[in-house]
C-alpha cells in the first residue's frame, strides 16, 4: 500500500503579469469530504507558507481575502493560481494536501513546481 501520492508539474513559467497556474492532483486513500491544500515555497532551504485553503468536496476553494492564491477544485484535482509574483519570488512551490475529514487524517506532499518569474522590461521612454 503506497502513501498518498501528490502530483504537480515540475516547471511553470509565470506570465509577464506575474501570474502562475498549476494543477495539484492527489490520489486519495480514503473518501475525504474535507481537504486542506497548502502551498509552500522552498528557497535557499527556507520554507514559507504561501497560502492555504480548506474546502469541502464539490465546493469551491476559499482562500483568505488577502491571499495571493486563488483556486478551483474538481474531484481529486486542485487548480491553483498564484498572483503578484516578481523575479525574487522564483522558487520551488510545493503542494501539501491533508485529508481532514472524515477520519483518519492523511498527509501528502508533492515534489514541487519550480516557478520562474521574469520581471517585465520597463517600457522605453518615448520621444513623441
Amino acid at each position: 500500500c503506497k502513501a498518498m501520492h501528490v502530483a504537480q508539474p515540475a516547471v511553470v513559467l509565470a506570465s509577464s503579469r506575474g501570474i502562475a497556474s498549476f494543477v495539484c492532483e492527489y490520489a486519495s486513500p480514503g473518501k475525504a469530504t474535507e481537504v486542506r491544500v497548502t502551498v509552500l515555497r522552498q528557497a535557499d532551504s527556507q520554507v514559507t507558507e504561501v497560502c492555504a485553503a480548506t474546502y469541502m468536496m464539490g465546493n469551491e476553494l476559499t482562500f483568505l481575502d488577502d491571499s495571493i492564491c486563488t483556486g478551483t477544485s474538481s474531484g481529486n484535482q486542485v487548480n491553483l493560481t498564484i498572483q503578484g509574483l516578481r523575479a525574487m519570488d522564483t522558487g520551488l512551490y510545493i503542494c501539501k494536501v491533508e485529508l481532514m475529514y472524515p477520519p483518519p487524517y492523511y498527509l501528502g506532499i508533492g515534489n514541487g513546481t519550480q516557478i520562474y518569474v521574469i520581471d517585465p522590461e520597463p517600457c522605453p521612454d518615448s520621444d513623441f
Epitope: 502513501a3 486513500p29 510545493i94 501539501k96 477520519p103 483518519p104 487524517y105 498527509l107 506532499i109
Partner: antibody, heavy 120, light 107 residues
Framework: QVQLVESGGGVVQPGRSLRLSCAAS????????MHWVRQAPGKGLEWVAV????????YYADSVKGRFTISRDNSKNTLYLQMNSLRAEDTAVYYC?????????????WGQGTLVTVSS | DIQMTQSPSSLSASVGGRVTITCRAS??????LNWYQHELGKAPKLLIY???SLQSGVPSRFSGSGSGTDFTLTISSLQPEDFATYYC?????????FGPGTKVDIK
Amino acid sequence: QVQLVESGGGVVQPGRSLRLSCAASGFTFSSYGMHWVRQAPGKGLEWVAVIWYDGRNKYYADSVKGRFTISRDNSKNTLYLQMNSLRAEDTAVYYCARASGSYSYYFDYWGQGTLVTVSS
Amino acid sequence: DIQMTQSPSSLSASVGGRVTITCRASQSISSFLNWYQHELGKAPKLLIYGASSLQSGVPSRFSGSGSGTDFTLTISSLQPEDFATYYCQQTYSTPFTFGPGTKVDIK
C-alpha cells in the same frame, strides 16, 4: 522559551472521570496543533489524541475513542483532555506535546508529564 | 491503522561505539517519520524529523535515513548521555503510531 506544564493527574477509581490541563507559554499557542501522548508503567509511548490549531479537527486513538475528549482554549493558552469511563489500562504518565513542521508534523516540545492512576 | 515495528528491542553498546536502530512501517509512510529519545522520568526529546532532518540543537552524531516503509536511526559514536530508549513515530496518518521502542544500555 517554550514551556508546557501538565496538571490534573492523580488517583481515580475505574469508571470515574478526570480532566487534564496543559498550560502553554513562550509561543503563539493558537498557531499550533497540540497532542496528548501517554506512557503506561513499563510500556512504550502511545499517541492519544490531537487537536488542530483552531480546534476544528480532532483525532483519537482507538483505545480512547468515545471516552476521551481533547479540547483547547486559545484565549487561555491551555490544552485539555477530558477522560471519562476510566479503566485500569488508562494508568499512565500523560504528556502534552506541540506539533511543528511545514512539510510534516513532529513533536518538538513536550511537557514533563502528569501521572494518572486508575485503581479501586 | 499503521503498525510500527523496531529492531532490536534492546541492545548493549560501548561508549564510542556505533549503534543502528531500524524501524519498519506496515505500509508506506513516505518520509513522514520522526525519531525521539526518552529517558525515564524526563520528557521525550525530538532527534530526527522527516526521516532524515536533524532537529536544531541535536548533536550531529545522530542521523536518520529511509523512506517508504524502512527507516534507520544511527548514532555514530555513542556518548554516556545517549543511553536511553529510542522511538520512531509516523505522522502520515492518524493514529500517529509510535514504534515499541529500542532500549540502549551500557555494555
